[in-house]
Interface confidence: low
């Protein structure tokens, strides 16, 4: 049996997958759940497993094709349903009308690498993986820097309001050891958020040179 | 077989209100979006709106303050109420439906209704 | 809105004729519909997503073009072709219609 309020969330990459998140305030036992997508003006229609991932939440991905397959634009709208097993039937817990493109969260960018490091300096470039060229050059980037002796939430935020896929970071200290992260949104999209953050990428600065003042 | 029935047309009063109604056969409302558009005598087409699957709609801009499209999917029926009219919102009033593949445009089409807003 | 502009606005052609009418785009759009309208009847859908054929649509009809610019052909008029032809876009909302070609019969 299922009592208390519930939240349904859910995200498209931009091409083909959206990832959805269901929450359930009231018990869930033993009871088998899916997401299921059902576009609008489409053939096709998808279904996935909802796994849990905390006490009182469940996710899914709905993977709608090749990941850089277009599989929906901006004029799409898919309803999505929870669906949870009652016995020999299938009862509706959530449904919402999906607009892909006013719900977006790009997946992490990737590739990160340096290209140039530095005493006081380090140049890293990346890439965005699986986003739509719908977006041109409409995206930002924050990116942050961990220092030694810090967390990653007390890393000042560096924002690029731009499709900018580089950075240089200044003003480091010599021979240090840091990590940097970069995330991704599109302009686009009243419910849009910002990407997962990459994997960091550790870089160390080079040492001063010996026989000089600093 | 899929079809559309529009009915609810007639002749209206400037500034009264219309309501119309789509009734939707050999497919369900709750699967398939169903838009209305319209057409003033001797004129074009025009896109007034939709109602999705699930109950959302999207409404062209030049009209969101006074229409409302809503239905009821326990008697599959699709309904266009419009306020405010105008002499110049004259027109036969159609209710459609997109395919069923990727894309493939208004496949479906009501016969139409017509309004006439005089008084 | 993105503007639809269909020329020409009528035409009169002969049986067998081959007849183009154009669509223009005021921006890009990604897919484009043609209908068929006879008169006190309902549009009917011919080509779908720029260039495929609706169902039960004979061959003469075709569709081709990208982005701002998109035409449609009847290969060879035939009497029963006499109609109002409309483009339409689905790529932005609102959705928009040319304001029609009138095809007759010379």
């Known amino acids: 049996a299922v009592n208390g309020t519930s939240q349904f969330t859910c995200f498209y990459n931009s091409r083909a997958n959206i990832s959805c998140v269901w929450s359930q305030d009231g018990a869930l036992q033993d009871t088998s759940c899916q997401v299921h997508a059902w576009p609008d003006r489409r053939r096709w229609n998808q279904t996935c497993e909802l796994l849990p991932v905390s006490q009182a939440s469940w996710a899914c991905n709905l993977i709608l094709g090749a990941p850089d397959s277009q599989k929906l634009t901006t004029v799409d709208i898919v309803t999505l349903r929870v669906l949870c097993r009652e016995g020999v039937r299938w009862r509706v817990m959530a449904i919402q009308d999906f607009k892909p493109f006013e719900n977006l969260r790009l997946m992490a960018p990737i590739s990160l690498q340096v290209v140039h490091v530095e005493t006081h300096r380090c140049n890293i470039s990346w890439e965005i993986s699986q986003a739509s060229h719908y977006f041109e050059r409409h995206l930002e980037f924050e990116a942050r820097t961990l220092s030694p002796g810090h967390t990653w939430e007390e890393a000042p935020l560096l924002t690029l309001k731009q499709k900018q896929e580089w950075i240089c970071l200044e003003t480091l200290t010599p021979d240090t050891q840091y990590e940097f992260q970069v995330r991704v949104k599109p302009l686009q999209g009243e419910f849009t958020t910002w990407s997962p953050w990459s994997q960091p990428l550790a870089f160390r600065t080079k040492p001063a040179a010996l026989g000089k003042d600093t | 077989e899929v079809q559309l029935l529009e009915s609810g047309g007639g002749l209206v009063q400037p500034g009264g209100s219309l309501r119309l109604s789509c009734a939707a056969s050999?497919?369900?409302?709750?699967?398939?979006?169903v838009h209305w558009i319209r057409q003033a005598p001797g004129k074009g087409l025009e896109w007034l709106g939709v109602?999705?699957?699930?109950?959302?709609?999207d409404y062209n801009a030049a009209f969101i303050s006074r229409l409302t499209i809503s239905k009821d999917n326990s008697k599959n029926t699709v309904y266009f109420q419009m306020n405010s009219l105008r002499a110049e919102d004259t027109a036969v009033y159609y209710c459609?439906?997109?395919?069923?593949?990727?894309?493939?445009?208004?496949?479906?089409w009501g016969q139409g209704t017509l309004v006439t807003v005089s008084s | 809105d993105i503007q639809m502009t269909q020329s020409p606005s009528s035409l009169s052609a002969s049986v067998g004729d081959r007849v183009t009418i154009t669509c223009q785009a005021s921006?890009?759009?990604?897919?484009m519909y043609w209908y068929q309208q006879r008169p006190g009847k309902a549009p009917r859908l011919l080509i779908y997503?720029?260039?495929n054929l609706a169902s039960g649509v004979p061959s003469r009809f075709s569709g081709s073009g990208s982005g701002t610019s998109y035409t449609f052909t009847i290969s060879s008029l035939q009497p029963e072709d006499i109609a109002t032809y409309y483009c339409?876009?689905?790529?932005?909302?609102?959705?928009?219609f040319g304001q029609g070609t009138k095809v007759e019969i010379k």
């Open positions: 459609a439906r997109a395919g069923d593949a990727n894309y493939d445009g208004f496949a479906y």
């Open positions: 050999g497919f369900s409302v709750t699967s398939y979006g």
């Open positions: 109602i999705w699957s699930g109950g959302s709609t």
């Open positions: 921006s890009s759009v990604s897919f």
């Open positions: 997503d720029t260039s």
């Open positions: 339409q876009q689905w790529s932005t909302y609102p959705l928009t």
